[in-house]
Amino acid sequence: FERTRSLQDPCSNCPAGTFCDNNRNQICSPCPPNSFSSAGGQRTCDICRQCKGVFRTRKECSSTSNAECDCTPGFHCLGAGCSMCEQDCKQGQELTKKGCKDCCFGTFNDQKRGICRPWTNCSLDGKSVLVNGTKERDVVCGPSPADLSPGASSVTPPAPAREPGHSPQ
């Protein structure tokens, strides 16, 4: 099949890193500097991505693969292939249009990115707050209030009822 395809289209013989020149009898020519072709048989080379500004080069462009970027310190990647860099904030903050702002009471963010999220509502699961939440940490839920009432234990099963006339041994 490949041989038949090659007879039909001479460009299919051009490997990655080259292009099939429309203007020169479809000969395979190497991609020029700052361009690449990642697949064979291409008629044009793609322009290399340039990691400028807040972007920094994680992987250089080659004749067969595009450059890959990440973000300079203080920023993190967003989007497919790190298409954007977003400013980091401290834990306990979120990024707004006006910059990094502390999480409102009742919310937290344990990362340098993303938004402040509400503390877990322990009572929805029938539990109580074991450790209070902060701007940086969610609350820790513990056993339910009923489990903590005097004489009750959530760990040991209740003792069997004693028969009358028997004293404990």
Partner: antibody, heavy 121, light 112 residues
Framework: SVEESGGRLVTPGTPLTLTCTVS????????MTWVRQAPGKGLEYIGI??????TYYASWAKGRFTISKTSSTTLELKITSPTTEDTAIYFC??????????????????WGPGTLVTVSS | AAVLTQTPSPVSAAVGGTVTISCQAS????????LSWFQKKPGQPPKLLIY???SLASGVPSRFKGSGSGTQFTLTISDLESDDAATYYC????????????FGGGTEVVVK
């Protein structure tokens, strides 16, 4: 040949998609560019698409326009949220790469006749 | 982004005369040569005149001549005809995945 269509009067914020239909060649063989000219202004580069479908935009056009290929002969330009400043004639052109560089060189030829987009409330 | 500055505008000359339009780039174009010239008339699409700084596009009369390299380019129109009245634009190719192309501001040619 190259021909644009889809230009019309739209209100600000209403997305609009322009179409560039080519004949006599395949979009996979060439870079294609979109250029516009606002009334009384000069030519302004919007962006290009490679034969393999990769897109590149002018910095001012990023996020405001989307170039896509819907078939081997049909290219689209979407104006995501038009403003009155986007009122212009929009042109589509092939990059002939007559010097054989293998990528876009600015040898834009042929051009379509253009399609007029008017953004007004 | 690079800037292409065209001078002068407008430029005027008599039929049979010669006009020279300059295109000054703030940064060198790719290969010092990837610069094109276009003719634009009202109601018509641009027309490619010169590519790769000095190569004449197909069907363009040899009265149009492009020259220059790097950051300084010139379009010369000799034996001026009335039909040459138009606005002329240069465009440069840059090694960037954004602002890959930049157009000059245009130069109007008036034929007297």
């Amino acid at each position: 040949s190259v021909e644009e269509s889809g230009g019309r009067l739209v209100t600000p914020g209403t997305p609009l998609t322009l179409t560039c239909t080519v004949s006599g060649f395949s979009l996979s063989d060439y870079y294609m560019t979109w250029v516009r000219q606002a009334p009384g202004k000069g030519l302004e580069y919007i962006g290009i698409m490679s034969g393999s479908g990769s897109t590149y935009y002018a910095s001012w056009a990023k996020g405001r326009f989307t170039i896509s290929k819907t078939s081997s002969t049909t290219l689209e330009l979407k104006i995501t949220s038009p403003t009155t400043e986007d009122t212009a004639i929009y042109f589509c052109a092939r990059d002939g790469d007559y010097a054989g560089w293998g990528y876009a060189t600015g040898a834009f030829d042929p051009w379509g006749p253009g399609t007029l987009v008017t953004v007004s409330s | 982004a690079a800037v292409l500055t065209q001078t002068p505008s407008p430029v005027s000359a008599a039929v049979g005369g010669t006009v020279t339009i300059s295109c000054q780039a703030s940064q060198s174009v790719v290969g010092n040569s990837l610069l094109s010239w276009f003719q634009k008339k009202p109601g018509q699409p641009p027309k490619l005149l010169i590519y790769s700084a000095s190569s004449l596009a197909s069907g363009v009369p040899s009265r149009f001549k492009g020259s220059g390299s790097g950051t300084q380019f010139t379009l010369t129109i000799s034996d001026l005809e009335s039909d040459d009245a138009a606005t002329y634009y240069c465009t440069g190719r840059y090694n960037s995945d954004t602002d890959t192309f930049v157009f000059g501001g245009g130069t109007e040619v008036v034929v007297k």
